[in-house]
C-alpha cells in the first residue's frame, strides 16, 4: 500500500547537471531503509508515455545517469523515481521540468598558463561535453553557446588586477615584472543564460630577466 506521504520514502528528486552530464539524484525519506529499491523512468515534455531507464531498475544507489536520454538540447524532460521498500510500500516522485541548456552548470575551464619574462600567456582549451553531433564528434561548450565568453584576471598585487576577455582561446598579459609571482583566474561566462563557471586558477611566476646577467 502507498504511504500517506511519499516523502516518507523519497525526497529531493532532481537533476544535477554539469557540462551537460545530467544525473538524476534523490534521497531516501525518514522511512527509507538500505534495502529500499528505486526504479527510474523519464520522458520528453509533451510525450505521454514514460520510458524505463535500463540499468536503473530496482537499484539501491541514489543516482542515475540520464545524460544520453536527455541529450537533445532543444527538448525539455521529466524523470521520476519509484521507491519500493522491503515491506512493499511504494512512493513515486517526479522532477521539475528539466532543460539542460537552462539548468546545466559550468565546470572551470581547462587552461594552460605559460610564463614568459615580462608576460603570462593563457591558453583556454575547448571544453568537451558528452553530447554528440550528427557526425559523431563531441560538441564543445563553444559549439553550444554562441555567447560563451572567457573572463581572465591576473592579480598583480593586493590592489591591482589586470583583466582580459573575449571569445578567443589565447590571451597574454603584458608589461609584467620579471621573476614575480602572479595569480591568474579564468572563468567561462554565458551572459544570455546567466551562467558563470567556478574559476580555474593558476599561480605562475614570470621568468627572470637574464639579459642583465
Amino acid at each position: 500500500h502507498a504511504p500517506e506521504d511519499p516523502s516518507d520514502l523519497l525526497q529531493h528528486v532532481k537533476f544535477q547537471s554539469s557540462n551537460f552530464e545530467n544525473i538524476l539524484t534523490w534521497d531516501s525519506g525518514p522511512e527509507g531503509t538500505p534495502d529500499t529499491v528505486y526504479s527510474i523512468e523519464y520522458k520528453t515534455y509533451g510525450e505521454r508515455d514514460w520510458v524505463a531507464k535500463k540499468g536503473c531498475q530496482r537499484i539501491t544507489r541514489k543516482s542515475c545517469n540520464l545524460t544520453v536520454e536527455t541529450g537533445n538540447l532543444t527538448e525539455l524532460y521529466y524523470a521520476r523515481v519509484t521507491a519500493v521498500s522491503a515491506g512493499g510500500r511504494s512512493a513515486t516522485k517526479m522532477t521539475d521540468r528539466f532543460s539542460s541548456l537552462q539548468h546545466t552548470t559550468l565546470k572551470p575551464p581547462d587552461v594552460t598558463c605559460i610564463s614568459k619574462v615580462r608576460s603570462i600567456q593563457m591558453i583556454v582549451h575547448p571544453t568537451p561535453t558528452p553530447i554528440r553531433a550528427g557526425d559523431g564528434h563531441r560538441l564543445t561548450l563553444e559549439d553550444i553557446f554562441h555567447d560563451l565568453f572567457y573572463h581572465l584576471e591576473l592579480q598583480v598585487n593586493r590592489t591591482y588586477q589586470m583583466h582580459l576577455g573575449g571569445k578567443q582561446r589565447e590571451y597574454e598579459f603584458f608589461g609584467l615584472t620579471p621573476d614575480t609571482e602572479f595569480l591568474g583566474t579564468i572563468m567561462i561566462c554565458v551572459p544570455t543564460w546567466a551562467k558563470e563557471s567556478a574559476p580555474y586558477m593558476c599561480r605562475v611566476k614570470t621568468l627572470p630577466d637574464r639579459t642583465w646577467t
Epitope: 550528427g134 564528434h137 553550444i144 554562441h146 582580459l164 582561446r169 544570455t192
Partner: antibody
Framework: EVQLVESGGGLVQPGGSLRLSCAAS????????MYWVRQAPGKGLEFVSV????????HYVESVKGRFTISTDNAKNTLFLQMNSLKSEDTAVYYC??????????WGQGTQVTVSS | DIVMTQSPSSLSASLGDRVTVTCQAS??????LNWYQQKPGQAPKLLIY???RLRIGVPSRFSGSASGTSFTLTISGVESEDLATYYC?????????FGSGTRLEIK
C-alpha cells in the same frame, strides 16, 4: 586562404521567396559559427542569423523569425539562408561571415536582394 | 537587446589629424567590442577586437580604448586611405548589434 562567396540574390516580389548560398573554403567549415549579415541601401549593418555548423544551433534577429531559415550542407561547405514572405524592408546586400579563433573576421563580397513589385 | 549608440554620424578631418569615434553600450558588454572599417562597395574589415586589441596587419595609428560601457576608436594620424565608414560591434550577446556608423571624410 579563407574565402566566402555568396550567391542567389535577385529581384523578388513582396511575399516571395529566395534562397541565398555561401560557398566556404580555407577553414574548418564543419566546426564553426556562420552568420548572415545584411545592409540596407545607405544604411548600417544588421546581423540576421547565425548557425553552429557542428551542433546545428541557430539564432535569428526578431524581425526575421518565422520567415527566414539558416542551414548548412557540411559535405559541400555551404551555408544557406531560405527567405520566405519577403518584405520591402528585407531589401539589402546580404553578406555571409564566419567566426575564426573567436573573431568575426572574414566576410563574403555580398549578394544583392531587392524586394519590390 | 543591447543598443550601441555611436557618435558622431560623420566627421571631416585633414590628413594627419587625430580623430575619435565613440560608442556607448546600453548595458555591460565587458570588453566584447570590435571596430570595423567599411569602404564603399566592400565588406567590413576588422580593425580592433576586445575593445583595445589591434588586429594583425592593421596600422598602429588605429587604437581602441574602453571605460565602463563607453568605447573609443582613435586614428592618431589620418591618411587618405582611411576614408571609410567605421562601425562598432558588440560581440557579447545575440543579437549582435552594430553602432549606426561614422562616416569619415578627408578635407
Amino acid at each position: 586562404e579563407v574565402q566566402l562567396v555568396e550567391s542567389g540574390g535577385g529581384l523578388v516580389q513582396p511575399g516571395g521567396s529566395l534562397r541565398l548560398s555561401c560557398a566556404a573554403s580555407g577553414f574548418t567549415f564543419s566546426s564553426s559559427w556562420m552568420y548572415w549579415v545584411r545592409q540596407a541601401p545607405g544604411k548600417g549593418l544588421e546581423f540576421v542569423s547565425v548557425i553552429n555548423t557542428r551542433s546545428g544551433i541557430t539564432h535569428y534577429v526578431e524581425s526575421v523569425k518565422g520567415r527566414f531559415t539558416i542551414s548548412t550542407d557540411n559535405a559541400k561547405n555551404t551555408l544557406f539562408l531560405q527567405m520566405n514572405s519577403l518584405k520591402s524592408e528585407d531589401t539589402a546586400v546580404y553578406y555571409c561571415a564566419t567566426r575564426i579563433q573567436g573573431l568575426i573576421d572574414y566576410w563574403g563580397q555580398g549578394t544583392q536582394v531587392t524586394v519590390s513589385s | 537587446d543591447i543598443v550601441m549608440t555611436q557618435s558622431p554620424s560623420s566627421l571631416s578631418a585633414s590628413l594627419g589629424d587625430r580623430v575619435t569615434v565613440t560608442c556607448q553600450a546600453s548595458q555591460s558588454i565587458r570588453s566584447s567590442l570590435n571596430w570595423y572599417q567599411q569602404k564603399p562597395g566592400q565588406a567590413p574589415k576588422l580593425l580592433i577586437y576586445g575593445a583595445s586589441r589591434l588586429r594583425i596587419g592593421v596600422p598602429s595609428r588605429f587604437s581602441g580604448s574602453a571605460s565602463g560601457t563607453s568605447f573609443t576608436l582613435t586614428i592618431s594620424g589620418v591618411e587618405s586611405e582611411d576614408l571609410a565608414t567605421y562601425y562598432c560591434l558588440q560581440d557579447y550577446t545575440w543579437p549582435l548589434s552594430f553602432g549606426s556608423g561614422t562616416r569619415l571624410e578627408i578635407k
